[in-house]
């Protein structure tokens, strides 16, 4: 039902869902800090624009009695329970920040009359695509899929002269929330990725993965998996790997690859890492100092969610427009705003665009080096290292099918 919003007369409130079930196991205190830091910035920006208004956040905590798995499995009802709590208390703000779990976001979107914008740090699954009042500030599965198809088809780079049309996908069910939905999207038979590939098999057992590494009868040389180096090593161990195997390790929200003094372990030589370009100052900023490299992006998305609201509020107030309207609810897309660490672009469907980076391990220096970048906004690949020091023969990525000639 329609809930009255605390969103007028110079006082604008943000409802922040603090759910026990979250896409990343980040202490809620850190998310609160991120939101409060965002509020300070927003207040400053509004004041500089001559807008004398009040902006606050209300943190809505779950009681945690029923929905206590801590991950996203029991998040579906938790989100709706929190909305009910908001409704009963008549405490709905101008915008809803959270939830991060795909299940809860999908259900909340489905079961509520959304006349207010919803900003999510997460909601990675395809089921949250193309939602009119939902904005996602962490790269959703659709963006990953488009990169992979683009990269598979690429055949005109000095280091990639073959189009690929096959892949194995390793998915054993123990993945983190982001990885679960990324791999889910690749697995889905109706997805763009599946549609564009001629052969795709999901490996669900560790042994299946391990056997493929040296199987002469394998149907593809390419294996996609999701996680960090430790995750790969736990699975692969010290096993030998055929020379034309390419492992694509999706590790989007991990800034460690760009930190000082990082050297790649031996087992990463057959691996291309797909990650996100780190923010200019985020690695050393006061905001991220207490956060682990894999959690920075999550807390940053909360902070940027606040800044996005401030951006939209400023525009609507300057134009003398009402905030509690469907127009405002639908406005959080197809725009660029000033995020904590530089401009943030949202596509036509409210999903964040970013620069994805494909890294390889230099056999000379044992360092991670940028092979290419990919701009999700324009769906375009930009080669960076034209003569990479690969482990693969002739410093070129192999064909995806052993023994097949040029395509």
């Amino acid at each position: 039902s329609q809930v009255s919003q605390n969103c007028h007369n110079g006082s604008y409130e943000i409802s922040v869902l603090m759910m026990g079930n979250s896409a990343f196991a980040e202490p809620l205190k850190n998310l609160e800090d991120a939101v409060n830091e965002g509020l300070e910035i927003v207040r400053g920006r509004l004041q500089n624009a001559g807008l004398n208004v009040t902006v606050n956040a209300t943190f809505m905590y779950s009681d945690g009695l029923i929905h206590n798995s801590g991950d996203c499995r029991s998040s579906t009802c938790e989100g709706l329970d929190l909305l009910r709590k908001i409704s009963n208390a008549q405490r709905m703000g101008c915008v809803l920040i959270g939830p991060s779990c795909t299940y809860s976001t999908f259900q909340m979107y489905l079961d509520t009359e959304l006349s207010y914008p919803m900003i999510s740090a997460g909601s990675f699954g395809l089921s949250c695509d193309y939602k009119e009042t939902l904005t996602r500030l962490m790269s959703p599965a659709r963006k990953l899929m488009y990169f992979l198809v683009n990269f598979w088809k690429t055949n005109d780079l000095p280091f990639k002269t073959y189009s690929w049309s096959t892949s194995y996908v390793y998915k054993n069910g123990t993945e983190t929330e982001d990885c679960f939905w990324y791999l889910n999207a690749l697995e889905a038979s109706v997805s763009y990725f599946s549609h564009e590939l001629g052969f795709k098999v999901v490996l669900r057992q560790d042994k299946e993965f391990q056997d493929i590494l040296m199987d002469h009868n394998r149907k593809s040389n390419v294996i996609i998996m999701c996680g960090g180096p430790e995750f790969l090593y736990k699975l692969k161990g010290d096993r030998a790997v055929a020379e034309d195997i390419v492992i694509i390790l999706v590790d989007l929200f991990n800034d460690q690859y760009f930190e000082d003094n990082v050297t790649a372990p031996d087992y990463m030589k057959n691996v291309l890492v797909l990650t996100l370009s780190p923010g200019n100052s985020l690695l050393n900023s006061s905001f991220s100092r207490n956060l682990s490299p894999t959690k920075r992006d999550f807390a940053l998305a909360y902070l940027n969610g606040i800044l996005l609201f401030g951006h939209m509020l400023k525009i609507f107030l300057e134009n003398g427009e009402n905030i509690t309207t469907p127009k405002f609810a639908h406005a959080f897309r197809n725009l660029t705003f000033e995020g904590y660490d530089g401009p943030v672009t949202l596509d036509d469907w409210g999903d964040v665009d970013s620069t994805m980076v494909l890294l390889y391990t230099s056999v000379d220096t044992k360092k991670y080096k940028v092979l290419l970048t990919y701009d999700t906004h324009v769906n375009k690949t930009y080669p960076v290292d034209m003569s990479p020091t690969f482990t693969w023969k002739n410093s070129k990525l192999p064909n995806d099918i052993t023994g097949r000639g040029p395509q």
């Epitope: 960090g228 180096p229 430790e230 090593y233 161990g237 010290d238 460690q256 930190e259 003094n261 990082v262 050297t263 372990p265 087992y267």
Partner: nanobody, 115 residues
Framework: QVQLVESGGGLVQPGGSLRLSCAVS????????VDWYRQAPGKQRELVAG???????TYLDAVEGRFTISRDNVKDTVYLQMNSLTPEDTAVYYC?????????WGQGTQVTVSS
Amino acid sequence: QVQLVESGGGLVQPGGSLRLSCAVSRNIASLYRVDWYRQAPGKQRELVAGRTSGGTTTYLDAVEGRFTISRDNVKDTVYLQMNSLTPEDTAVYYCHAHDHWRDSWGQGTQVTVSS
């Protein structure tokens, strides 16, 4: 970064034995690998013995059969048992670890083989 502290070096006669220890500041099982390197005066540092957490061990040809690398997961300590020592084994021995992200080195312990 991982802190590594070596001990057990000293002066030993040819044919004698020594056991070097490397105390690790982190849970050893969480590391990718722990190794022993050595550097003799005027020479390059070389890998003497190494062990990955997957259990694979590697040895320098010149020490194969004489040196043994082992680890104690409870004490978070790595050992290098050195038998049948020769003057060519004289060097500073360094403990090295890689935690999947970074290399860490100890300060080294001097081993001198002389009669």
